[in-house]
């Protein structure tokens, strides 16, 4: 999916008002310095691509974040403010229903959510030059 035509300011508002709090809740008990940020993004569409990938694609050691509250809110925000995104997800969900996974919070998941926090921070500051 191409995130170029999303309403970035509305997505940012949703992040600031609610998604960010859920990410903080998920990370509660973890030191902010515990993980190094290794994933970066260069502009808002790129940030959303990376955020979607890290949030919804299973990775080794972290089977699924998709059922977390921050993930559900992220996907809803993308569905509302990214034209055509909703239709792509309705189709994808049919396949996902067949692979139900037990919810386990692992250290790898915590690291992944830490990376997500960094991507969201970058998304919210699009005019900053890439380090």
């Amino acid at each position: 999916y191409d995130f170029t035509n999303c309403d970035f300011e509305k997505i940012k508002a949703a992040y600031l008002s609610t998604i960010s709090k859920d990410l903080i809740t998920y990370m509660s008990g973890t030191k902010s310095t515990e993980f190094n940020n290794t994933v970066s993004c260069s502009n808002r569409p790129h940030c959303l691509t990376e955020i979607q990938s890290l949030t919804f694609n299973p990775t080794a050691g972290c089977a699924s974040l998709a059922k977390e509250m921050f993930a559900m809110k992220t996907k809803a925000a993308l569905a509302i403010w990214c034209p055509g995104y909703s239709e792509t997800q309705i189709n994808a969900t049919q396949a996902m229903k067949k692979r139900r996974k037990r919810k386990v919070t692992t250290n790898k998941c915590l690291e992944q959510v830490s990376q997500l926090q960094g991507l969201w921070r970058r998304f919210n500051r699009p005019l900053l030059k890439q380090q």
Epitope: A66, M69, K73
Partner: nanobody, 118 residues
């Protein structure tokens, strides 16, 4: 399995109001997303509003300030209060629920038609 049954659709004049209901039965889960989608003839299905189990809500720009989504967990029912209706709100409205198996919308209602016309 979850079943969703919508009600409350119908014909209303521009500027009027309707309240849609979506009753859920079956396997009810505590962490959820419930949403109202709509599909006008010849257009894609669009998410107009969503409510989460923590009470937070999201609205599409086209309905913000006119529509209000709510949920009564004791009745396993979600609502969409639609005020100041416009002809462009005419569509089939679907409620959907998710969060159990995929984190997205796993279960869908059959849809209820809302027609705004004088």
């Amino acid at each position: 399995e979850v079943q969703l049954v919508e009600s409350g659709g119908g014909l209303v004049q521009p500027g009027g109001s309707l309240r849609l209901s979506c009753a859920a039965s079956g396997n009810i889960f505590s962490r959820y997303i419930m949403g109202w989608f709509r599909q006008a003839p010849g257009k894609e299905r669009e998410l107009v509003s969503a409510i989460f189990s923590d009470g937070s809500t999201l609205y599409a720009d086209s309905v913000k300030g006119r529509f209000t989504i709510s949920a009564d967990n004791s009745k396993n029912t979600a609502y969409l209060q639609m005020n100041s209706l416009k002809p462009e709100d005419t569509a089939v409205y679907y409620c959907a629920k998710g969060g159990y198996s995929s984190g997205w919308f796993d279960y869908w209602g059959q849809g209820t038609l809302v027609t705004v016309s004088s």
